[in-house]
């Protein structure tokens, strides 16, 4: 049951009033307004949109709305020297060239400033050589190539299909394998759902469609030139050679029509198994190089993009809290898009806009939240989460002392099947309780709760009768708040049916075809799923900002800590002899988890019983809840990843999008049988167990009675 405090207002101003004010028609209107022209980070168009949002948030009734600007490293294609890939014959003549742009969608033929497909932050270069097909370019794909098939990628150009993991990890893996260039392409197996037409007749990717995206490996650093500090007017900037996370080899994305031309000639080794075959009519040979008649032909990349320090603008809106103005609940999502941003990000930005409007309406009627709510429209998310990270770096001291929660608001939809939530365990009960109060928008669930349809369609793998809630990974603007600062975070959106749709993301992701019409015609004509997402995101913000006692349940953290400890122990136990030889024990970790469980249980009992009318005790208990997430932060960070400081969760070292539990131990154990110095490797495992056990114990102690 939700606990809302009406501050200085009549009882009607509660969660229901806030939710009832949210309107699907408004979200639709806002989405249309945000998607008529491209809003690429660093462009005049995106600056104008920032000013428009600033103006409208002020009209909606926020107390203040400011632009926060930073000068960060961005990347753009050279307008007069386009990027492309060729097949060259033995005389060096280009006998095939990939397309220079995507055919524009109907109605957008005359739109200017559509950035052609490119891999942001690719270095310049014109490498030529034999091609090697590396499947998804995951760690395990390179293991298969190098260890099982004994194929050496050194000095080769690799071609990888998009999907499964973040593209930056693919490029990093290719670099480590010695490749001199990377071609990324969208295979219909991953980006063309059976039985659906391609855009504009359906939501599938046409052959000329291409996914843009950055290929950085920032590991939470933000602007590559100012890691750890804001890229402000007096910033000291690193030289480009010392910049964080930049790729060292040229990279370029293509569509499946062009990929067909490259892959159909491939020779060398056959694919190792069916998991390496996509849906094109090509053999999916691994190479290296082309087959028989074409063996003298090579592939050549022509990449001329430039990295430029460019000004970006966040919009920061404030709704001051009436009782605890120094406690911040943040709702943030990005504004910049690769092209029109029909889904990413404007389906999220439109929802934020409507949430701000609803909160503003309540405020105009005399209501204020208990705690301060900050609303953010982030810039340059697509270039490495830059806007959010720079703002958090600039405000880190305030945020670490005052930050209660961060709710992310990128794309509201990636499908229209069911809800998808990733969040800290502290928010599990909040999400459960809220979704029980909301109506499901799903067909066949009329009159039923969102919780019911969500649980039916996406059941928890561990707990029957409960929905799946996933770990936070990265690849979005919550990263700095959760992984670096330890602020409780969550995200929600509507998603596809992962059982029947095995494609990665949604087919038109980061392409020119991500338009308003894509959403309005094919995904959510009634905008009912958008409205539901607005209710979930907005409802979470409302409750976090307005409940007397913070809606965090520390017992849920205890449950997952035990699960994660069991998981990492079982991974380690695949090496029983080494554990014995090097005296590796998990006793300290299990003991810390047991202590955490007991202390969390006692804290929860005290939370039920304490005198909520005593503001000092209330504040003390709330602070213990607020600072619990912070207690999982190790100031030294993870090995070689200083800005990933959360000991329980980090983005996977093999896929930035995925979350990994006990990442320090996990990475120390990963592929440990290939570490040449087992004594050193197992020593690091022991050190990471020590760090994890200490951190869990220390976090537990923050929940103990204070005196």
């Amino acid at each position: 049951k939700s606990s809302n405090e009406a501050t200085n207002i009549t009882p009607k101003h509660n969660m229901k009033a806030f939710l009832d004010e949210l309107k699907a028609e408004n979200i639709k209107k806002f989405l249309y307004n945000f998607t008529q022209i491209p809003h690429l980070a660093g462009t005049e168009q995106n600056f104008q949109l920032a000013k428009q949002i600033q103006s409208q948030w002020k009209e909606f009734g926020l107390d203040s709305v400011e632009l926060a600007h930073y000068d960060v490293l961005l990347s753009y294609p050279n307008k007069t020297h386009p990027n492309y890939i060729s097949i060259i014959n033995e005389d060096g003549n280009e006998i095939f060239n990939t397309s220079l742009f995507e055919p524009p969608p109907p109605g957008y033929e005359n739109v200017s400033d559509i950035v052609p497909p490119f891999s942001a932050f690719s270095p310049q270069g014109m490498p030529e050589g034999d091609l090697v097909y590396v499947n998804y370019a995951r760690t395990e794909d390179f293991f298969k190539l190098e260890r099982d098939m004994k194929i050496n990628c050194s000095g080769k150009i690799v071609i990888a299909r998009y999907g499964k993991v973040f593209r930056g990890n693919k490029v990093k893996n290719a670099q480590l394998a010695g490749a001199k260039g990377v071609i990324l392409y969208s295979d219909p197996a991953d980006y063309f759902a059976p039985g659906v037409k391609s855009y504009p007749d359906g939501w599938n990717l046409p052959g000329g469609g291409v996914q843009r995206g950055n290929i950085l490996n920032l590991n939470g650093a933000g602007d590559p030139l100012t890691p750890g500090y804001p890229a402000n007017e007096y910033a000291y900037r690193r030289g480009i050679a010392e910049a964080v996370g930049l790729p060292s080899i040229p990279v370029h994305p293509i569509g499946y029509y062009d990929a067909q031309k490259l892959l159909e000639k491939m020779g060398g080794s056959a694919p190792p198994d069916s998991s390496w075959r996509g849906s094109l009519k090509v053999p999916y040979n691994v190479g290296p190089g082309f087959t028989g008649n074409f063996s003298t032909q090579k592939v050549k990349m022509h990449i001329h993009s430039t990295n430029e320090v460019t000004r970006i603008y966040n919009v920061i809106g404030t709704l001051r809290g009436a009782v605890e103005p120094d406690r911040y609940v943040i709702l943030g999502g990005h504004r910049d898009s690769w092209v029109f941003g029909g889904i990413d990000p404007q389906s999220g930005a439109a929802v934020v806009h409507e949430i701000v409007r609803s909160f503003g309406t309540l405020k105009k009627e005399g209501w204020r939240p208990r705690r301060t709510i900050l609303f953010a429209s982030w810039d340059a998310e697509e270039f490495g989460l830059l806007g959010s990270t720079e703002w958090a770096e600039e405000n880190s001291r305030l945020l670490q002392e005052r930050g209660v929660a961060y709710i992310n608001a990128d794309s509201s939809i990636e499908g229209n099947y069911t809800l998808r939530v990733d969040c800290t365990p502290l928010m599990y009960s909040l999400v459960h309780n809220l979704t029980k109060e909301l109506k499901s928008p799903d067909e066949g669930f009329e009159g039923k709760s969102l919780y019911e349809s969500w649980t039916k369609k996406s059941p928890s793998p561990e707990f029957s009768g409960m929905p799946r809630i996933s770990k936070l990974g990265s690849g979005n603007d919550f990263e700095v708040f959760f992984q670096r600062l330890g602020i409780a975070s969550g995200r929600a959106r509507y998603t596809k049916n992962w059982e029947t749709n095995k494609f990665s993301g949604y087919p038109l992701y980061h392409s020119v075809y991500e338009t308003y019409e894509l959403v309005e015609k094919f995904y959510d004509p009634m905008f009912k799923y958008h409205l539901t997402v607005a209710q979930v995101r907005g409802g979470m913000v409302f409750e976090l900002a307005n409940s007397i006692v913070l809606p965090f349940d520390c017992r849920d953290y205890a449950v997952v800590l035990r699960k994660y400890a069991d998981k990492i122990y079982s991974i380690s136990m695949k090496h029983p002899q080494e554990m014995k030889t090097y005296s590796v024990s998990f006793d300290s970790l299990f003991s810390a988890v047991k202590n955490f469980t007991e202390i969390a249980s006692k804290f929860s009992e005290r939370l039920q019983d304490f005198d909520k009318s005593n503001p000092i005790v209330l504040r003390m208990m709330n602070d213990q809840l607020m600072f619990l997430e912070r207690a999982f932060i190790d100031p030294l960070g993870l090995p070689d990843r200083p800005f990933y400081r959360h000991v329980i969760y980090a983005p996977s070292s093999h896929n930035k999008y995925a979350g990994e539990s006990f990442p320090g131990i996990y990475d120390a154990l990963f592929d440990i049988e290939s570490k040449v110095d087992p004594s050193k490797a197992w020593g690091e495992v022991k050190r990471q167990i020590y760090v994890a056990a200490f951190t869990v114990q220390a976090a537990a102690e923050t929940l103990s009675e204070v005196a």
């Epitope: 080494e578 049988e673 570490k675 040449v676 087992p678």
Partner: antibody, heavy 117, light 108 residues
Amino acid sequence: EVQLVESGGALVQTGGSLRLSCVASGFTFSNYWMSWVRQSPGKGLQWVASIKKDGSDEDYVDSVKGRFTISRDNAENSLYLQMTSLRIEDTAVYYCARFISAVGVDWGQGALVTVSS
Amino acid sequence: DIQMTQSPSSLSASVGDSVTITCRASQSINNYLNWYQQKPGKAPKLLIYTASSLLSGVPSRFSGSGSGTDFTLTISGLHPEDFATYFCQQSFSTPPITFGQGTRLDIK
């Protein structure tokens, strides 16, 4: 402590056969590629053969292909080298070794194989 | 196959001296070069892997450097127990795993 103990070294006639064994302890045998390396008297080291963790893949130096067979029994933590059609130039100390990422991390004490005419 | 050539094939030095052994690969092997020490009647012992990484327990007087095709093993301040034969080995392109022919370090 990691230990590799070879056995089966002997004096054998040219054209004859011999089977070397190696018992491993102190590490999870089934997680590692294993190899045989030999050293002729007063000479350098020569890699002979390697076998994948699960025994599904084998590699040999050209000079022993078709004559030597590497195998393993993960249940017994044992590595074997079956040598046939032995030649004078196969005379050497044969080391069982754990190669990690193609680096010889742990070695046995060696088994002497002498091939005489 | 990648050929490994070591030089010198033998050298004499005194306790306290510093010595350098070189190894050259017939093609670039990045930093995939390892050094072993072998004493008479004993198995080889790994000292350095990936050109410069010292194995746990190996004294810090041993150091390795180089990348591409040219590599060196340096022993700074010889101890009596350091007189042995040293082998380099490439682990870049395998199979086959190939070794240098060895450098015998004798006491002067």
